[in-house]
């Protein structure tokens, strides 16, 4: 059997030794102590008696079937707990009732039905994150459960197999910050929705498929909730359950952000709110993410006008990887407030990106992300953007565009644009010279000689220059990032001749190792300030005497340099 | 430059199955949608279904739902396209294609030649 | 499934002739101002090439006497002046609606 290995600070790691009990020999002196993926089945009371002062306890993944009742009892420090992913049928509130510093529990993946007879958490005054049920097994939630919580950061409760909820069991802990909830079916969605309006921030429903959800209206008074952020995460949801789940909306007023991650749409796009929900709903809502959507029938996905105005008010709108081809053209005249878009992962060509930034598209549009599409023509994407009059940012990195032309229009307002990861060889005039981000970085570029009066911050990392631009290019420059290129010196002159120069990043390129360089950066200890990753990320690539060197530490002979 | 390879041709009895490979290289494999279509001796183009090899997700001509299975090897850039319950209506050149922009086919393989004959 | 009627099925024209190719759907293949509608060359013993998508614009790389036009339901190929090269089938497909579906191609051929 292995050993615990310790740091100085008191931090063991006993994690996959093949442990099948606490191991002995375990002192004050500990202050966190691994023991996940091991086979321990059993703790004992005695067990843990001589960490007195251990603050972390991670027992994950470990076969755990048996904990004494005062097995942790001298863990008055214990701040972190896990017992996740073990064999525990059933808990016991006298394992916690000494844990009064606890602040973090997580109890997930346990194959117990209840959280146990009584309270298990009344003496947890201080406890923020709690993680509790589990796929198969955790069936009930009732109001004994949370009684002694008033107020925590996180709550995850995974309760796919629930078959019973008992009204206001979650209402007594009056401020949950984050609530995510694993849930199979919508059944009890109701019940546990009007229990926490007037307690949860942030709102996270996993796993729940939304078919069948039918709203009906909620037993509570006029209440102001606080929930801020909703999320939705591998969820099901049909056209008409979309427009039952609007309803819920009227209950929280203060929402600013909706989210839908890998969920499924078995629908066509046909939402039919009714009017007064058109009129009410998405009040104060400024923020929509959509991330992996997948909608079996994209091909015949309607135009979303039955919710345009309920969209007239958000400002940022994200539709990540969800295999978007087109945005009709009357849409994107409706989204009026919107400044932000991420367009990310999708499958835009310019062609049809024309119709989408059509004329009156998105007239507040600031930003305006198209990583990773299947944009082609570099002059034609500039050219279609001109009706966006209030773009100054622009992402269109990862697409494999044609090599660049010599001159393109864009915006006149534009400022940064990210070309990074496109391929590009060259760079002409058809950049703008209103920049002042410009991100060219991961491409074929063995030369940069582009005048760009505004410039104030270069990304050129991961590309082929062998030297630095000539900084007469840039006469603003606060920001050059040039790593991993094939730089092989910089002088005083160099850097001297950016006046304004704040940050230089160009770690990881070859460096020859001559004396004037060596002298330089042996002279001039200011260069600590201004170059990043100094001095670790700069070596010598040659003379074959210094090679792996760092720039810093490199000697260069004295017959070498005073030839 | 944008290329997709597919495999030789191919000799197969009635009632037996076919897998054909695509090889892409010259762009990101996983940004976009392979498709594959056939072609009857001296016929038209018929087609067969696609694969989005980010994630997987796949759509079929109904014709060949109960016949056709779409995969991808994202560490091979590769496409396959087995078809099952082989008869001599199968006989054809298959095609495989990169999908643009959702709704356009601008790179195809060679083809593959797929004779079945007892 | 929209089912694709090209027309004539075959074109017979001199060198340096306009050649007209026509292709109408049984449906609108219209996606909200946008038509699904693309065109294919392809030449004996190859692959079929893009000439055209979105019905009117024409692939990178593709020469500039072909284009393409129509909405709804009729899509029309043009050549400004056919050339020897354009000898082949010439094939319209959709993708408003699956399956996708060509049409039954027209053969161009020089006189």
């Known amino acids: 059997q292995e050993s615990l290995s310790c740091d100085a600070s008191g931090v063991c790691d006993g994690r996959s030794r093949s442990f099948t009990s606490i191991p002995s020999g375990l002192t004050a002196a500990m202050k966190s102590l691994d023991l996940s993926f091991n086979k321990i089945t059993y703790i004992g009371h005695g067990d843990l008696r001589a960490c007195a002062n251990l603050q972390v306890l991670m027992l994950k993944s470990s076969r755990i079937n048996t904990i004494e009742g005062d097995a942790f009892y001298s863990l008055g420090s214990l701040e972190h707990l896990d017992l996740s992913d073990n064999h525990l049928s059933s808990l016991s509130s006298s394992w916690f009732g000494p844990l009064s510093s606890l602040k973090y529990l997580n109890l997930m993946g346990n194959p117990y039905q209840t959280l146990g007879v009584t309270s298990l958490f009344p003496n947890l005054t201080n406890l923020q994150t709690l993680r509790i049920g589990n796929v198969e097994t955790f069936s009930e939630i009732r109001r004994i459960d949370f009684a002694g919580l008033t107020s925590l950061n996180e709550l995850e409760i995974k309760a796919l197999s629930l078959r019973n909820y008992q009204s206001q069991s979650l209402k007594s802990i009056r401020d949950i910050h984050h609530l995510t909830l694993h849930l199979s079916e919508s059944a009890f969605l109701l019940e546990i929705f009007a229990d926490i309006l007037s307690s949860v921030r942030y709102l996270e429903l996993r796993d729940t498929n939304l078919a069948r959800f039918q709203f009906s209206p909620l037993p509570v008074d006029e209440v102001s909730s606080p929930m801020k952020k909703l999320a939705f995460r591998g969820s099901v949801l049909t056209d008409e359950s979309f427009n039952e789940l609007l309803k819920l909306l009227r209950y929280i007023l203060e929402l600013s952000e909706v989210e839908f991650d890998d969920c499924t749409l078995n629908g066509l796009g046909d939402f039919n709110p009714s009017e007064s929900d058109v009129v009410s709903e998405l009040g104060k809502v400024e923020t929509v993410t959509i991330r992996r959507l997948h909608i079996p029938q994209f091909y015949l996905f309607y135009d979303l006008s039955t919710v345009y105005s309920l969209l007239e008010k958000v400002k940022r709108i994200t539709v990540e990887n969800s295999k978007v081809f087109l945005v009709p053209c009357s849409f994107s005249q409706h989204l009026k407030s919107l400044e932000f878009l991420d367009l990310s992962e999708n499958l835009m060509v310019e062609e049809y990106l024309k119709n989408s930034a059509c004329k009156g598209a998105w007239p507040s549009l600031q930003t305006l992300v198209l990583s990773q599409n299947h944009l082609r023509s570099m002059q034609k994407t500039g050219e279609i953007l001109l009706t966006l009059k209030n773009l100054t940012s622009l992402d269109i990195s990862r697409n494999t565009f044609h090599p660049m032309p010599d001159s393109c229009q864009w915006p006149e307002k534009m400022r940064f644009l990210n070309l990074s990861s496109t391929g590009i060889r060259v760079v002409k005039t058809c950049i703008p010279q209103t920049l002042e981000v410009l991100d060219v970085s991961n491409n074929n570029l063995d030369s940069f000689s582009l005048f760009l009066p505004r410039l104030q911050e270069l990304y050129i990392s991961r590309n082929k220059l062998k030297t630095l631009p000539d900084a007469s290019l840039f006469p603003v420059l606060l920001v050059m990032k040039i790593r991993e290129n094939a730089v092989s010196t910089f002088s005083k002159d160099q850097l001297g001749s950016f006046p304004k120069l704040e940050t230089l990043e160009a770690g990881d390129n070859h460096f020859v190792c001559s004396c004037e360089l060596l002298s330089f950066t042996m002279e001039t200890p200011a260069l600590a300030q201004i170059l990043v990753d100094w001095p670790d990320s700069y070596l010598c690539d040659s003379p074959p005497r210094l090679h792996g060197h760092r720039l810093q530490d490199a000697r260069p002979s004295v017959l070498e340099c005073h030839q | 430059q944008v290329q997709l390879v597919q495999s030789g041709s191919e000799l197969k009895k009635p009632g037996a199955s076919v897998k054909l490979s695509c090889k892409a290289s010259g762009f990101t494999f996983t940004t976009y949608g392979i498709n594959w279509v056939r072609q009857a001796p001296g016929q038209g183009l018929e087609w067969i279904g696609w694969i989005y090899p980010r994630d997987g997700s796949t759509n079929f001509n109904e014709n060949f739902k109960d016949r056709a299975t779409i995969t991808v090897d994202t560490s091979a850039s590769t496409a396959y396209m087995e078809l099952s319950s082989l008869r001599s209506e199968d006989t054809a050149v298959y095609f495989c294609?990169?999908?643009?922009?959702?709704?356009?086919?601008?790179?195809w393989g060679q083809g593959t030649t797929v004779t079945v004959s007892s | 499934d929209i089912v694709l009627t090209q027309s004539p099925a075959t074109l017979s024209l001199s060198p340096g002739e306009r050649a007209t190719l026509s292709c109408r759907a049984s449906e609108s293949v219209e996606y909200y101002g946008t038509s699904l509608m693309q065109w294919y060359q392809q030449k004996p013993g190859q692959p079929p090439k893009l000439l055209i998508f979105g019905a009117s614009n024409v692939e990178s790389g593709v020469p500039d006497r072909f284009s393409g036009s129509g909405s709804g339901t009729d899509f029309t190929l043009k050549i400004s002046r056919v050339e020897a090269e354009d000898v082949g089938m010439y094939f319209c497909?959709?993708?408003?609606?699956?399956?996708?579906?060509f049409g039954g191609g027209t053969k161009v051929e020089i006189k």
């Open positions: 294609a990169r999908l643009t922009g959702g709704t356009f086919l601008d790179y």
């Open positions: 497909q959709q993708s408003r609606k699956l399956p996708w579906t």
